[in-house]
Amino acid sequence: REEAKPYPLFPGPLPGSLQTDHTSLLSLPHTSGYQPALMFSPTQPGRPYTGNVAIPRVTSAGSKLLPPLAFKHTVGHIILSEHKDVKFNCSISVPNIYQDTTISWWKDGKELLGAHHAITQFYPDDEVTAIIASFSITSVQRSDNGSYICKMKINNEEIVSDPIYIEVQGLPHFTKQPESMNVTRNTAFNLTCQAVGPPEPVNIFWVQNSSRVNEQPEKSPSVLTVPGLTEMAVFSCEAHNDKGLTVSKGVQINIKAIPSPPTEVSIHNSTAHSILISWVPGFDGYSPFRNCSVQVKEVDPLSNGSVMIFNTSASPHMYQIKQLQALANYSIGVSCMNEIGWSAVSPWILASTTEGAPSVAPLNVTVFLNESRDNVDIRWMKPLTKRQAGELVGYRISHVWQSAGISKELLEEVGQNNSRAQISVQVHNATCTVRIAAVTKGGVGPFSDPVKIFIPAHGWVDHAPSSTPAPGNA
């Protein structure tokens, strides 16, 4: 803003070039091809103006009563095209007795501060100073539309000019454009388009896949009801006014479809009875995934070929398949669904569970005391383990010694070729409780039922063995 600081008003000639005709206070550059703006005055020339005046309350001794202060009439309405330049002014004659004056520009009730092109010029004479405040806008935009006024503060009074209405006309401007949508096949939907001038009216044509939908334009705003689509389409709208036409962005209307199958399924971890998988979802078919299905088939000529189905949420894209058999081969596929339906199953991938622990305990466990050697003999039969338990690597023997006030558990490991073991007597006059479990790479199986034997004090002999019966012999 180039407004001068408040000037002391001093006498001097008023330049002859200053004209009082209110229309001449509007200045517009005449460039090549330039159309002069239209101008309307809110009041007729010469008509007395009584609004927004300041009446001086104080007069110096012997002086005449000063006339009311008011801004001169100027152009009231300027219509011009976007990107043109415009300059408009307000003027006022102020008696020289007023030492400090400032003029400010306001638009739509807010003061225009900062880097606006406002210039105030002073033309002093003997008794009054003519002040012309001009405001210029280069390359006007729609945002420059509005009501502009000048304000002058003088002796704590505020003088306000008539408003100058700036109307920037241009191509239609969209306030609402159609939005991309994902719709169900053959289902009706609406698209909305709204554009404004000035100039008004703004008329709307709808375009589908480069062809106009409506032969007759509709006044903005316009709602297009599409009865339904069977395939993807691109819609846009054309907004027309006297200045020309603006085309909205083209929006794609997608038809919801079943998703594509996942594009990657990975095995992350396998245990004896579970497999952790992840997948990368395929294209969602323009409809969010709802859930996924993990399908599992056992790859075994002897299996009945049935498929286990595990339903899970669509996210995270990971699932731990449980309740599987140990040391088994599985074929795994993943399918996901959206509101339309299920995707095809991904290509089947292969995965194997690891060895499991044995599911049965050793059989016919017998325990007897060999007093001469001061040890306990333990014998058993190899359990009938399933193939899934994997290869037997040995046995774990638990023996617990209990006597008055003490209890002590010891564990022994023996190799898979053994079916007997000897353990040293730990405590006399005590009960020894023996249990045996089979061991594979998959882990330790269940322990056999406990077999108890009493270890007497030294010198007392009983060779009678203790045993667990074999299954079916009880």
């Epitope: 594009t263 990657e264 990975s266 992840s278 979802p281 991904s346």
Partner: antibody, heavy 119, light 112 residues
């Protein structure tokens, strides 16, 4: 949907070269990608795969000679120390489905970019 | 190492005739069926024809068919057309840690 390779040019032996693959119409966050090459007048050779969920997997002969990497928008193939035997057209290819680095099928091929290694 | 062998490097066929191309895998391909076939014309990239041994890729004429499982696979083109003169490659996925994919050496089809 399309795949496009770039970066192929004449290089001298031993000068590292990086080829870039850009895609459109689909997302690299969804698909594994492979590189395949073809020497003039010869057959197709698979170099490796960069998956979404696991580390890159290379053909045995290609390990150490090539590095495959990916960003959110590109897949890159670095020829670490080219020899004259690496003169070929290099194709970037979308993998329709994969598991643990095993491609199921290669369904979308780029036009290829020619690399010439000569002193 | 994974090897796919296409025994015939070139085969001829008359227009309207039938062509059979074989592909042998060692070892067996992943899941017994992860084998695909590709067509390559001079100056062009390969194009997917068949996957999972027998499934037709999108947009491929039904005159192309595939069969086989495990280690032996066949591509058949019936009612051969002139523009199907090309080199055909088999390719397979394998379950080892590396070399998880390999191409056969290719078979050129000459249409007379």
């Amino acid at each position: 949907q399309s795949v496009e390779e770039s970066g192929g040019r004449l290089v001298t032996p031993g000068t590292p070269l990086t080829l870039t693959c850009t895609v459109s119409g689909f997302s690299l966050s969804t698909y594994s990608m492979s590189w395949v090459r073809q020497a003039p007048g010869k057959g197709l050779e698979w170099l490796g795969i960069v998956s979404v969920a696991i580390d890159p997997v290379y053909a045995t002969w290609a390990r150490g000679r090539f590095t495959i990497s990916r960003t959110s928008t590109t897949v890159n193939l670095k020829i670490t120390s080219p020899t004259t035997e690496d003169t070929a057209t290099y194709f970037c290819v979308r993998v329709a489905f994969s598991t643990n680095g095993i491609p199921h099928r290669l369904d979308l091929w780029g036009q290829g970019t020619l690399v010439t290694v000569s002193s | 190492a994974q090897v796919l062998t296409q025994t015939a490097s070139s085969v001829s066929a008359a227009v309207g005739g039938t062509v059979t191309i074989s592909c042998q895998s060692s070892p067996s391909v992943y899941n017994h069926n992860w084998l695909s076939w590709y067509q390559q014309k001079p100056g062009q990239p390969p194009k997917l024809l068949i996957y999972e041994a027998s499934k037709l890729a999108s947009g491929v004429p039904s005159r192309f068919s595939g069969s086989g499982s495990g280690t032996q696979f066949t591509l058949t083109i019936s009612d051969v057309q002139c523009d199907e003169a090309a080199t055909y490659y088999c390719a397979g996925g394998f379950s080892s840690g590396s070399d998880s994919f390999a191409f056969g050496g290719g078979t050129e089809v000459v249409v007379t």
